[in-house]
């Protein structure tokens, strides 16, 4: 018996061939011997089966001795043995229809679980394997689960069902809702304007929800809410904003915040959360601000940084075009009795400069100038 695998919602064509290459009497029946369709001369006739409005044939092929049964918009319950009777012979075809669906919305938050459920005909014992867009494979029976979805899991999942040594392939598009970056860090000199950007890693027609940025300043004992906002169809509207600092928020996506001045008291880390309508859970992005200040007081030239710096970062003070006078893995360095000239304060990581502040030291009878 020939086995054909079909996909729920698709169209399948079951073949039936006569030895005579001409139009002759044929009909298709199901396993209960109920007639589905057949011919009367050059006319297609239909029987009382449940497939009535979804069954068809190709009249153009009858003259060649081919009498296919076409079933449209396949349902799982169409799985059956179909019998073609032609020329006093019977051809049996077993049709098995499978469906694969995501048990929830296909738009899932980063970190959530995806469960794929296989609908299969009674008595079948299929094996299923799915490959994610990043090449990760999962194998299962009637259900397949992936916990802790990652951003790279966004895209087309290719799932293969094996039954009776035959295969059928499904494609499911999954969108993982997340920010492009889990964390970002901004390095600024004191007094500079700070731009925080929170680009999303997905695009959807309508995006509605609400968000908040909580900030933990390094100098503060507790965190505070800097801003809360609403998102309606990609339009941003501020609900509540702190008075200090005076934050400004862009009205369009990507989410964008401006801090007029980088000051040591603002250095720290924040957590932007975004709750999307009809989704349980929230999107998160961490943002960090590091602020640098270079000062000269009497005979002491000091360079300081505030904010979340890694222990491997190097802070240096050097006279322009000369070797570093002082270089330490600390958040403050200083030089006593600095010689006159343009001094550079550098924050670097493995030789790469992340932040630089220049300060001009005048001869001892003058006051310092900060460019």
């Amino acid at each position: 018996k020939k086995v054909v695998l079909g996909k729920k919602g698709d169209t399948v064509e079951l073949t039936c061939t006569a030895s005579q290459k001409k139009s002759i009497q044929f009909h298709w029946k199901n396993s209960n011997q109920i007639k589905i369709l057949g011919n009367q001369g050059s006319f297609l006739t239909k029987g009382p089966s449940k497939l009535n409005d979804r069954a068809d044939s190709r009249r153009s092929l009858w003259d060649q001795g081919n009498f296919p049964l076409i079933i449209k918009n396949l349902k799982i319950e169409d799985s059956d043995t179909y019998i073609c009777e032609v020329e006093d012979q019977k051809e049996e075809v077993q049709l098995l229809v499978f469906g694969l669906t995501a048990n929830s919305d296909t738009h899932l938050l980063q970190g959530q679980s995806l469960t794929l459920t296989l609908e299969s005909p009674p008595g079948s014992s299929p094996s299923v394997q799915c490959r994610s867009p990043r090449g990760k494979n999962i194998q299962g029976g009637k259900t397949l689960s992936v916990s802790q979805l990652e951003l790279q899991d966004s895209g087309t999942w290719t799932c293969t069902v094996l039954q009776n040594q035959k295969k059928v392939e499904f494609k499911i598009d999954i969108v993982v809702l997340a920010f492009q970056k889990a964390s970002s860090i901004v390095y600024k000199k004191e007094g500079e304007q700070v731009e925080f950007s929170f680009p999303l890693a997905f695009t959807v027609e309508k995006l509605t929800g609400s968000g908040e940025l909580w900030w933990q300043a390094e100098r503060a004992s507790s965190s505070k809410s800097w801003i809360t906002f609403d998102l309606k169809n990609k339009e941003v509207s501020v609900k509540r904003v702190t008075q200090d600092p005076k934050l400004q928020m862009g009205k369009k996506l990507p989410l964008h915040l401006t801090l007029p001045q980088a000051l040591p008291q603002y250095a720290g880390s924040g957590n932007l959360t975004l709750a999307l309508e009809a989704k349980t859970g929230k999107l998160h992005q961490e943002v960090n601000l590091v602020v640098m200040r270079a000062t000269q007081l009497q005979k002491n030239l000091t360079c300081e940084v505030w904010g979340p710096t890694s222990p491997k970062l190097m802070l240096s003070l050097k006279l322009e075009n000369k070797e570093a006078k002082v270089s330490k893995r600390e958040k403050a360095v200083w030089v006593l009795n600095p010689e006159a000239g343009m001094w550079q304060c550098l924050l670097s990581d493995s030789g790469q400069v992340l932040l630089e502040s220049n300060i001009k030291v005048l001869p001892t009878w003058s006051t310092p100038v900060q460019p």
């Epitope: 094996s127 490959r131 494979n137 194998q139 299962g140 290719t158 094996l162 040594q165 035959k166 295969k167």
Partner: antibody, heavy 117, light 107 residues
Framework: QVQLVQSGAEVKKPGSSVKVSCKAS????????ISWVRQAPGQGLEWMGW????????DYAHKFQGRVTITADESTSTAYMELSSLRSEDTAVYYC??????????WGQGTLVTVSS | DIQMTQSPSSLSASVGDRVTITCRAS??????LAWYQQKPGKAPKLLIY???RLESGVPSRFSGSGSGTDFTLTISSLQPEDFATYYC?????????FGQGTKLEIK
């Protein structure tokens, strides 16, 4: 990274059996099927059978039906292939490979089985 | 069982050449076809799956095409490390079957 490490070479007498192991690492064992493929000296590749490591379901090539048994032990992430009633023409390198229904993505280093009296 | 026939059985070419290997199935395998490269004493290595999808980490000079019964593996510009034996394999239905192989040698 994904690795399949097979047991060492074997020399067997005709009529006896051989059991080759394949230890998987670098991924969740039940997330891939395992197929076994053999290659006689100077010859091409020949598929022997497959196991669904999730359900234990097996499927064998007709040629080996009744002589081959493929098993998997999830607790040790190891697949096994046992071939019985050995004959000289079973002398070959036996490979285990991950089977995701699309292709054989990762392969073991191979195990040479020599059948000689 | 589905028979897979590769041509040519062997092929001599030079570094920089464009090379094409064909594979024919005895019945339609849709696009359920993979290509492998094997070097002496080593396990085969997957190059292409689903007829035209390049496996991760495989150089882009390798490409596959075809569907139904006729398939092609193309190496756009041969590199010294490409001299090996190449196999096609159908994964449309079990028993899975391989072509007899094409040995690519240096001219």
């Amino acid at each position: 990274q994904v690795q399949l490490v097979q047991s060492g070479a074997e020399v067997k007498k005709p009529g006896s059996s051989v059991k080759v192991s394949c230890k998987a690492s670098g991924y969740t064992f039940t997330s891939y099927g395992i197929s076994w493929v053999r290659q006689a000296p100077g010859q091409g590749l020949e598929w022997m059978g497959w196991i669904n490591t999730y359900s234990g379901y097996t499927d064998y090539a007709h040629k080996f039906q009744g002589r081959v048994t493929i098993t998997a032990d999830e607790s040790t992430s190891t697949a096994y292939m046992e071939l019985s009633s050995l004959r000289s023409e079973d002398t070959a390198v036996y490979y285990c490979t991950t089977d995701d229904f699309l292709s054989f993505g990762y392969w073991g280093q191979g195990t040479l089985v020599t059948v000689s009296s | 069982d589905i028979q897979m026939t590769q041509s040519p059985s062997s092929l001599s070419a030079s570094v920089g050449d464009r090379v094409t290997i064909t594979c024919r199935a005895s019945e339609s395998v849709s696009t359920w076809l993979a290509w492998y490269q094997q070097k002496p004493g080593k396990a085969p290595k997957l190059l292409i799956y689903k007829a035209s999808r390049l496996e991760s980490g495989v150089p882009s000079r390798f490409s596959g095409s075809g569907s139904g019964t006729d398939f092609t593996l193309t190496i756009s510009s041969l590199q010294p490390e490409d001299f090996a034996t190449y196999y096609c394999q159908q994964s449309y239905k079990t028993p899975y079957t391989f072509g007899q192989g094409t040995k690519l040698e240096i001219k």
